[in-house]
Amino acid sequence: SGPLPKPSLQALPSSLVPLEKPVTLRCQGPPGVDLYRLEKLSSSRYQDQAVLFIPAMKRSLAGRYRCSYQQGSLWSLPSDQLELVATGVFAKPSLSAQPGPAVSSGGDVTLQCQTRYGFDQFALYKEGDPAPYKNPERWYRASFPIITVTAAHSGTYRCYSFSSRDPYLWSAPSDPLELVVT
């Protein structure tokens, strides 16, 4: 028989965690697991439990995590990596829509995230969507064009800025921008 299937690793309520706020990392394998190992990659730090409760998020806890489990003498494949991001480390960027936050269906709009600092990475989140749109950009701003807008693009957007040197330490979120598709 081949290696044991990989467990899942999730962060609750979210993998984007404001500084000083709580988060729980949970590794989930099949029934009958003898031992879990949850490790913080690139740090030599680990624990032998399935659940890591972080009562207050700190910079030192931001980074990549993965977990695996043992049944008998066999170890599972490692879980997919989880990127735990500390937010609120830096001041919030500003988010604007060009030409404006109200756009006709079928039209084009560009969301622009701008910061006063020399960050080279930006992430745009739409409320309700699990994954961000990430955009590397150098000149203190990033553009997220939305071509041929549909009703599905309506919603609340926020952006973050960060540096590729510390990719898990992010700014506070921008003020929300409501995109209205008419």
Epitope: R45, Q47, I54, S60, L61
Partner: nanobody, 129 residues
Framework: QVQLQESGGGLVQAGGSLRLSCAAS????????MAWFRQVPGKEREFVAV?????????DHADSVKGRFLISRDNARHMVYLQMNSLNPEDTAVYYC?????????????????????WGQGTQVTVSS
């Protein structure tokens, strides 16, 4: 809210003793590694000692304090202690209590300040000659 509160610092004559205490709240104390660091103004924060819950409480002390300082912990009271004997003026510093949520698997990891997640405000220890 996680809080680490140091106490027990003060002024002591060379050759004397002090016992520092650290009260921890808001952290899963019995699964954490606890450590003491110290800092002299203008210098890096320096590792002093660590005690973890691995193997019933593994301890390690910096070479500069071995045989003079002893770290211990009381899990029931959520306390960590640093018994400091044979103090000399070079031990003058602000002493900080630190807590790590995770264990270390590599040598030197516990001596690295980046391995600790929560810090106290510090207590001043002054050793006069």
């Amino acid at each position: 809210q996680v809080q680490l509160q140091e106490s027990g610092g003060g002024l002591v004559q060379a050759g004397g003793s002090l016992r520092l205490s650290c009260a921890a709240s808001g952290v899963t104390f019995d699964s954490a590694a606890m450590a003491w660091f110290r800092q002299v103004p203008g210098k890096e924060r320096e590792f002093v000692a660590v005690i973890s819950t691995e193997s019933g409480g593994r301890t390690d002390h910096a070479d500069s304090v071995k045989g003079r300082f002893l770290i211990s912990r009381d899990n029931a009271r959520h306390m960590v202690y640093l018994q400091m004997n044979s103090l000399n003026p070079e031990d003058t510093a602000v002493y900080y209590c630190a807590s790590s949520l995770l264990y270390c698997s590599a040598s030197g990891c516990y001596a690295n300040r980046d391995s600790y997640d929560y810090w106290g405000q510090g207590t001043q220890v002054t050793v006069s000659s």
